[in-house]
Amino acid sequence: EEELQVIQPDKFVLVAAGETATLRCTATSLIPVGPIQWFRGAGPGRELIYNQKEGHFPRVTTVSDLTKRNNMDFSIRIGNITPADAGTYYCVKFRKGSPDDVEFKSGAGTELSVRAKPSAPVVSGPAARATPQHTVSFTCESHGFSPRDITLKWFKNGNELSDFQTNVDPVGESVSYSIHSTAKVVLTREDVHSQVICEVAHVTLQGDPLRGTANLSETIRVPPTLEVTQQPVRAENQVNVTCQVRKFYPQRLQLTWLENGNVSRTETASTVTENKDGTYNWMSWLLVNVSAHRDDVKLTCQVEHDGQPAVSKSHDLKVSAHPKEQGSNTAAENTGSNERNIY
């Protein structure tokens, strides 16, 4: 009779993570008598996956009934496959021996490849805000995928970016892989509503890539532009001085009026108006009673935006250009939240 052969008909088996892998194995003879064992890998470090004779292998089930005397099918199923299960599996026939069974013949091996989806890409931006014209870095990370081949693209508002660096780790063989990419983005004043998108394509995603996004509103700081103007109002001895704070982001802003260098009033931007590009405008005004002044007044609008050093704009109020009321050296404060008489 011809010597027993161990047949593993499948050279490769491809399984998605979470599924069950079937590893096929048949023997060509019932002789010699002895059990079958399954191993992952070869050499002294091979791992026992299933032993027909003894042991507890909760993830493994046999395809046929191995207790039947004439059984020659030693195929197994391994449940709930993970990337850690990847490797070459060998079906090995042992010959009954005393005191121990002796390895008799091995199958050629079946390489199990596990396809595992990448995790949702996580995009993170810089820790601190940056202003337009500055270059900022965004990172994108995705983990746990297999096989190693993966494609990563960066977009800003739908336009593909080219300035980025990507690494897939580890470099050598591994059960699963991670991708890490860093993209450089130049900020513009119009970027409050912009989005940076990291897109990951992998064989497990069937052409439907995963995306991670970051809103530039969390990264950008658009500093305000200031304009101080005056126009006469109400009585001829009163002047309305306005400070227009334009095109700033984020909203966090504090404004201080100074009269000849002395703090007159401080207020926080509340009722702002939003521009189409996502930036804000705000206006503060003062009612100045010029009759209370003998000399010219230097009015300064000082703005501290988002914790940054203050910026200011000054306006010289020519007192001589206005008639003075005798004895008028005090003025009542207006109740308007953005108005105040200076005296």
Epitope: G43, P44, E47, L48, P99, D100, E103
Partner: antibody, heavy 122, light 107 residues
């Protein structure tokens, strides 16, 4: 009780070969991989390779391929290692040890031979 | 190849003292690490297998542990026979590799 008895000290000339033995007793020889480890004078341990007596399957550390050759005689439960083209670098104590036929934690390198000292000198 | 970096290479300690030796693995080896003891006459004995399992006949003052890629052998309460050489060994991946060794000397 499991024991490994290694052959005695060898003095050899450069360019020649030496063959040392490791006889196992106390368990089934064919259920284990036999490993060889080198320790140079005042140095650490280096794994050379291993052999599986059932089918003479061998695995080597790349550094020792072509330098060491592993064989077994199952009938006498003896493992052999031949070290060829000897140089001063080969002067060392060589140990045999074993691991189970698959990667069973408890069986890795439990038992060790007493070592064979090889001195290479002109 | 997986590098096993063992520290310190030598250590002076006193009887009764507690000491720890460390091996750092350059790649993931899981728990597949042994600690070996070598006597001055060359005799090698395994103390710990699978990172923390104590071999039979080994005194309980020896223990093994792991933190990430760092593996430690701790001897609590040194005795005179403990002042010998110690090696770690990874058996996760071929070629199997050893740490450089630690020589434990009496103070």
């Amino acid at each position: 009780e499991v024991q490994f008895q290694q052959s005695g000290t060898v003095l050899a000339r450069p360019g020649t070969s030496v063959k040392m033995s490791c006889k196992a007793s106390g368990s089934t020889f064919t259920s284990y991989w036999m490993h060889w480890v080198k320790q140079g004078p005042g140095q650490g341990l280096q794994w050379i390779g291993a052999i599986y007596p059932v089918n003479n399957d061998t695995t080597y550390n790349q550094k020792f391929k072509g330098k060491a050759e592993l064989t077994v005689v199952t009938s006498t439960s003896t493992a052999y290692m031949e070290v060829s083209s000897l140089t001063n670098e080969d002067s060392a104590v060589y140990y045999c040890t074993r691991s189970f036929y698959y990667s069973l934690d408890a069986a890795w390198f439990v038992y060790w031979g007493q070592g064979t000292l090889v001195t290479v000198s002109a | 190849d997986i590098q096993m970096t063992q520290s310190p290479s030598s250590l002076s300690a006193s009887l009764g003292e507690r000491v720890s030796l460390t091996c750092r693995a350059s790649q993931d080896i899981g728990s597949r690490l042994n600690w070996l003891q070598q006597e001055p006459d060359g005799t090698i004995k395994r103390l710990i297998y699978a990172t923390s399992s104590l071999d039979s006949g080994v005194p309980k003052r020896f223990s093994g542990s792991r933190s990430g890629s760092d593996y430690s052998l701790t001897i609590s309460g040194l005795e005179s026979e403990d002042f010998v050489d110690y090696y770690c060994l990874q058996y996760a991946s071929s070629p199997f590799t050893f740490g450089g060794g630690t020589k434990l000397e009496i103070n």
